[in-house]
């Protein structure tokens, strides 16, 4: 398994991740957003809600 060198993003990247933590993937030369629960997207800009459907009458 290849090891990935990571560090915190530079101050220049403040505000890059809307709802998550910015980490710098050094060997890949890119910033990456680790999203908070409920958020997705490259910059954690999309909110998604997991809806639990009630059981249908047919199933009951």
């Amino acid at each position: 398994v290849a090891q990935v060198s990571i560090t915190k993003c530079s101050s220049d990247m403040n505000g890059y991740c809307l709802h998550g933590q910015c980490i710098y993937l050094v060997d890949m030369s890119q910033n990456y957003c680790r999203c908070e629960v409920g958020y997705t997207g490259v910059r954690c800009e999309h909110f998604f809600l997991t809806v639990h459907q009630p059981l249908s009458k047919e199933y009951v």
Partner: antibody
Amino acid sequence: QDQLVQSGAEVKKPGASVKVSCKASGFNIKDTRIQWVRQAPGQGLEWMGRIDPLRGNTKYREKFEGRVTITADTSTNTAYMELSSLRSEDTAVYYCVRSGTLFDFWGQGTLVTVSS
Amino acid sequence: DIQMTQSPSSLSASVGDRVTITCKASQDIHKYIAWYQQKPGQAPRLLIQYTSTLQPGVPSRFSGSGSGTDYTFTISSLQPEDIATYYCLQYDNLRTFGGGTKVEIK
């Protein structure tokens, strides 16, 4: 394949404005930040400013504040840099640069000549 | 704004020589420095980012080191194709380029 394609060369009179475009393909500019850098003939590289197309906010180098405006149109995946009150010292190649998801991916450059 | 002082502004060396360029930041830039090579008529080419991480396809004779405010770029054995101007760039807080170093063959 990711690309940043800039508009063609411009010749402007002193005091005029110029607007350079930078069209992205292969990626969404909302995932990135677009920086603008210029280089006068025989001179070094100079960072001018940047835009965050998703948030719409900008940061400018102090010396350009009030004279440069960086914008982005996310519907066409294009960023723009407008420089006003042009003077001969603004003659330079202007580059747009993608940063964020990938470290510093450059456009081909646009030569702006300011001459009376 | 962070200032980047790059030296020397130009140098002349023989093929095979070790070449060293330095950049000094006006404040701690936490290793967020990149090095570019630019040849006449071309856009700059990224060689190194985050002080010492070589980009894919960049020869191993190029290297970088440093921390805090002081950073060094080295070509271990100068080749004819290395004739170019080299720039440092800090990207810790906004962005600032060094003034450039023109490398020529003696």
